[in-house]
Interface confidence: low
């Protein structure tokens, strides 16, 4: 009203949603009696009466506050309670006695927002875009009043930038009278942003002070065009024959292009194009020399049918050959010489070894075993190892036999032999020579004849012991073209009063075995040979 | 057997330029990428630059693009690495040194010449 | 680019001791890294290559393990001549960025 004293600033109570805010009628009892006071509320310049005090006592007017007004401290303020977003708004109380005067409260409401949601743009962002493209979506659920939302990207607040970051922000309000905001992120992106950590903030305020919530981190999806492929080879280092190779190709792009691994054909020096597994991943299991070669790999973009090429990948898979030993087959006579050379092929230096079979002793470090004098324990087998020292594991070896020529040679001469009459005998005989011998037996019984290497054959004989047989003895005789021997088998009756130390005293004595013991066959050269080595 | 040796450094003012060479001997060189590497004194390695081993690809670090360019003649068997606008902070010793199994993207460099080196 | 680290800068350690040195890459880099030895006053070394493989004239007690970004060299038993800048260095893709490097001396 002109000429009137301008009204003080209304007093100021912040409350959050749901609870009680407190309205204390601030007038002196100068200015009014508090037994005598009208409330109203003002809205949008509206005053609306809300509830009488007469005489200390209060009464609610109808209306939308009528369930939710009380009096309080001595009738000094009026209590209202649930408070809703709509409640934010003037009230006043009215002094009638002795004269008309009134007092403002402003009630500002607060409720902090729900957990930022955001959702990342599941279709991705190419970095070429000519306009920002939408990054993701930030969504804060009833608040009040309207949250604020700040960017951040890799940690660092997100500015609007003319052409390369739009904020494009909106709200609805909630029956509730809450708002819930809306916030897309757009922005150009470049290729480094494939791993950049995006996340919104929402910015709001309580009646304790400002707060603010975080969303998740996220990354988008970020396109862009593959500017180098290459070939990566597992596993590293030296690759040999058997292994498992895979080659697979590699490029910097997103999503990266389509694969093809070709080989370069050393006839036609023309690349040919090698079939992959699902993943794009050519396996090579076994591995085979035949697999060495310059591999390279081409990325071909689907979208712009750009096609990039690897730089060529040398591939080498070791290897030895099939080892070849000459003579293949020696016969020499006793006292004569052998040379035997080994041969073989790799794509490494190869480094040789000659082995003696039967002990595994090594008898020489390189290809060429040269045997002098040779006795007749000098026949037999000879292996040649064909190894590469730099890649274990990669090596092939042959085997030779050596045959001396010579009567047939007897395990034992002779061998006593305690049994027991009427028991079943087995016995063994075992002969060497070349030509390899025949064994015959001297009495009647089932014999068996098993060749135990080209030069070495062993009889078995199961006869029945009776007292010719003990009388007799049993002979066998080994015949070859070079002559004829003989082992004697003497029997001899168990006296079991007096158990010898030849005796069986573990199996009852049912079977007796007469065979020669194990021997080493050692060989026979003009250099003292070394002891064997232990190859761990 | 298998050596790189390299020359061509010296004392030279700054924004001036000058060319390092690198001989290679006792392997198949046109066979392999290599590479330059550099040490300021007290400091750590620093990979400089590599080529392919036909010298179709190139690549460098940051500190030197656009100032430093990599080059090989494969009939001479010798690498080059041209610097120009050279600054203090190119003071280094210079190391050349091949590709183990001789692709640019590899795992590793198993020979290395000797240095040398260059004072800005 | 993707950045290396070491750890520790340097270390101390007595004749026969288990030394280890860490080298972590800031992205993946697969097995595609590569470990280093330089002694006072020489040129570097190549130890250990692809991660695990050992370089061939390195001694056995030299070890690399790990993949990915986080990778490990092992001296199983210190020796005097083992006293060294070692260094890690990515091959994955151009830059080959190499790590700061760990100092190693006897104590």
């Known amino acids: 009203v002109p000429g009137e004293a301008e009204q003080p600033a209304p007093e100021l109570v912040e409350v959050e949603v749901g609870s009680t805010a407190l309205l204390k009628c601030g007038l002196s009892q100068s200015q009014g009696n508090l037994s005598h006071v009208d409330w109203f509320s003002v809205h949008k310049e509206k005053r609306t009466l809300i509830f009488r005090v007469r005489q200390g006592q209060g009464q609610s007017e109808p209306g939308e506050y009528e369930q939710r007004l009380s009096l309080q401290d001595r009738g000094a303020t009026l209590a209202l309670t649930q408070v809703t977003p709509q409640d934010e708004r003037i009230f006043l109380c009215q002094g009638k006695r002795p004269r008309s005067q009134e007092y403002r409260i402003q009630l500002r409401v607060y409720k902090a927002p729900e957990e930022p949601n955001i959702q990342v743009n599941p279709l991705g962002i190419p970095v070429n875009s000519k306009e920002p493209e939408e990054v993701a979506t930030c969504v804060g659920r009833n608040g009040y009043p309207i949250p604020q939302v700040i960017w951040y990207k890799n940690g660092r607040p997100l500015k609007e930038e003319k052409n390369r970051v739009h904020i494009q922000s909106s709200q609805t309000v909630e029956s509730s009278g809450l708002y819930t905001l809306q916030s897309i992120l757009k922005a150009q992106l470049v290729k480094e942003d494939k791993d950049a950590q995006f996340y919104c903030e929402l910015n709001y305020r309580l009646p304790s002070g400002n707060h603010m919530k975080e969303s998740r981190e996220v990354t988008v999806p970020v396109f862009y065009p593959t500017e180098k492929v290459w070939l990566e080879v597992e596993p590293v280092g030296m690759l040999k024959e058997g292994d498992r190779v895979e080659i697979r190709c590699l490029a910097d792009g997103n999503p990266p292009p389509h694969f093809s691994i070709s080989k370069q054909n050393p006839s036609t020096r023309e690349a040919e194009e090698e079939t992959t597994n699902d993943n794009g991943v050519l396996v090579l299991e076994p591995a085979r020399k035949e697999h060495s070669g310059r591999y390279e790999c081409q990325g071909l973009d689907l979208d712009t049918m750009i096609s990039l090429l690897s730089e060529p990948q040398e591939l080498l898979v070791n290897y030895v050959s099939d080892v070849r030993v000459s003579p293949a087959a020696p016969e020499r006579q006793e006292g004569s010489s052998l040379t035997l050379t080994c041969e073989a092929e790799s794509s490494q230096d190869l480094e040789f070894q000659w082995l003696r079979e039967e002990t595994g002793q090594v008898l020489e470090r390189g290809p060429v075993l040269q045997l002098h004098d040779l006795k007749r324990e000098a026949g037999g087998g000879y292996r040649c190892v064909a190894s590469v020292p730099s890649i274990p594991g990669l090596n092939r070896t042959q085997l030779v036999n050596v045959a001396i020529f010579g009567p047939p040679w007897m395990a034992f001469k002779e061998r006593k032999v305690w049994v027991k009459e009427n028991m079943v005998l087995n016995l063994s005989c075992e002969a060497s020579g070349h030509p390899r011998p025949t064994i015959s037996w001297n009495v009647n019984g089932t014999a068996s004849e098993q060749d135990q290497d080209p030069q070495r054959v062993l009889s078995t004989l199961n006869v029945l012991v009776t007292p010719e047989l003990l009388e007799t003895g049993v002979e066998c005789t080994a015949s070859n073209d070079l002559g004829k021997n003989t082992s004697i088998l003497f029997l001899e009756l168990v006296n079991l009063t007096t158990l010898t130390p030849d005796s069986n005293t573990t199996t009852g004595l049912s079977t007796s075995t007469a065979s020669p013991h194990t021997r080493a066959n050692s060989t026979s050269t003009e250099r003292k040979l070394p002891e064997p080595e232990s190859r761990g | 057997q298998v050596q790189l040796v390299e020359s061509g450094g010296g004392v030279v003012q700054p924004g001036r330029s000058l060319r390092l060479s690198c001989a290679a001997s006792?392997?198949?060189?046109?066979?392999?990428?290599m590479h330059w590497v550099r040490q300021a004194p007290g400091k750590g390695l620093e990979w400089v630059a590599v080529i392919s081993y036909d010298g179709s690809n190139k690549y460098y670090a940051d500190s030197v693009k656009g100032r430093f360019t990599i080059s090989r003649d494969n009939s001479k068997n010798t690498l080059y690495l041209q610097m120009n606008s050279l600054r203090a902070e190119d003071t280094a010793v210079y190391y050349c040194?091949?590709?183990?199994?001789?692709?640019?993207?590899?795992?590793?460099?198993?020979?290395w010449g000797q240095g040398t080196t260059v004072t800005v | 680019d993707i950045q290396m680290t070491q750890s520790p800068s340097s270390l101390s350690a007595s004749v026969g001791d288990r030394v280890t040195i860490t080298c972590r890459a800031s992205q993946g880099i697969r097995n595609y890294l590569a470990w280093y030895q330089q002694n006072p006053g020489k040129v570097p070394k190549l130890l250990i290559y692809g991660a695990s493989t050992l370089q061939s004239g390195v001694p056995s007690r030299f070890s690399g393990s790990g993949s990915g970004t986080d990778f490990t060299l092992t001296i199983s038993s210190l020796q005097p001549e083992d006293v060294a800048t070692y260094y890690c260095q990515k091959f994955s893709s151009p830059p080959f960025t190499f790590g700061p490097g760990t100092k190693v001396d006897i104590s």
């Open positions: 006792g392997f198949t060189f046109s066979s392999y990428a």
């Open positions: 040194a091949r590709s183990i199994f001789g692709v640019v993207i590899d795992y590793g460099m198993d020979v």
